[in-house]
């Protein structure tokens, strides 16, 4: 009899801790899932934001078409520029077609007058071949007029209306694009 | 607390292939504008090789272009580089990075890449 009734208190004791562990568990859960709802909302709240706020080009950038384009106001050598594009979630301009680049020369001539602005074009050292930072070649008509006499890497620019080349290491302003946000309505 | 955990590196032959992969964990969201990786050789600057952006423009090195892909997994805040025709050059440590939207860059431990003739 004795032995019967300590069986039954070491199950009810078992059963005991299963239900503490059980309830351990779910408190985890639901502290989980309350911190995963903070980051859910946190989120949304985020995306909505921005959503509402959202027009095509962030401030300061100006919109043509699919892109956004941004004029720097400072000067670096051309490597730098293009991680200061990255920075931002962009790249050194890419220019692919002459209504394009006619919209940046036109654009600069508003902005700024004639100066000198990195694009992501850069000379292969070995073949002499000139490619944009994607690895695509620039279209005949989008070709360095000067070839530069530079024993260094060379890199484009654009200057009043011409695409120039210049020793990468030169510092310049320098031009950044990315995608201009489509709108959903 | 944003980590990055590179994998991949290793030794191989002159004209093999490798891939690299990073992925980004955070405690916290993070919105990240580029993702990219950069080497350094022994005695060089650390030096940019390949960069994609958010909306996928992508960025490459001279030295990387027609031989390195880079590609992303946005969902998963991961960054691939496959790099073919590997060459004794190409012998450095690979950094992966990225750039967030509050101007902060975070950069991984690096993983050794050599290249042996």
């Known amino acids: 009899k004795l032995l019967q009734v300590s069986t039954i208190a070491m199950q009810q004791q078992e059963k005991l801790i299963q239900q503490e562990r059980a309830l351990l568990n779910f408190t985890e859960w639901k502290r989980s899932c309350a911190l995963q709802m903070k980051y859910c909302q946190a989120f949304m709240q985020n995306s909505l934001s921005s959503a509402h706020n959202s027009s095509p080009c962030p401030n300061n950038w100006i919109q043509n078409r699919e892109s956004c384009y941004y004029v720097s106001e400072i000067w670096s050598i051309w490597h730098t520029s293009q991680e200061n594009c990255l920075k931002e979630g962009s790249t050194l301009l890419q220019i692919e077609s002459k209504e394009e680049m006619d919209f940046i020369t036109g654009s600069l001539r508003k902005i700024k007058g004639s100066y000198d602005y990195w694009v992501g074009l850069s000379q292969d050292g070995h073949s002499g071949r000139w490619l944009w930072q994607d690895g695509s070649s620039p279209s005949p008509g989008l070709l360095p007029a000067e070839r530069s006499q530079s024993a260094n890497q060379v890199c484009g620019y654009v200057k009043s209306n011409s695409l120039l080349s210049s020793n990468c290491s030169t510092w310049k302003y320098f031009i950044c694009e990315k995608y201009a946000l489509r709108s959903s309505v | 607390q944003v980590q990055l955990q590179e994998s991949g590196g290793g030794l191989v032959q002159t004209g093999e292939s490798l891939s690299l992969s990073c992925a980004v964990a955070?405690?916290?969201?993070?919105?990240?504008?580029?993702m990219g990786w950069y080497r350094q050789a022994p005695e060089k600057q650390r030096e940019l090789v390949a960069a994609?952006?958010?909306?996928?423009?992508?960025a490459y090195a001279d030295s990387a272009k027609h031989r390195f892909t880079i590609s992303k997994e946005s969902a998963r805040n991961t960054v691939h580089l496959h790099m073919s025709s590997l060459k004794p050059e190409d012998t450095a440590v690979y950094y992966c990075?990225?750039?967030?939207?509050?101007?902060?860059?975070?950069w991984g431990q690096g993983t050794q890449v050599t290249v042996s003739s």
């Open positions: 990075t990225i750039w967030v939207r509050d101007g902060q860059q975070y």
């Open positions: 955070s405690g916290s969201i993070i919105s990240i504008n580029s």
């Open positions: 994609i952006t958010v909306d996928g423009r992508l």
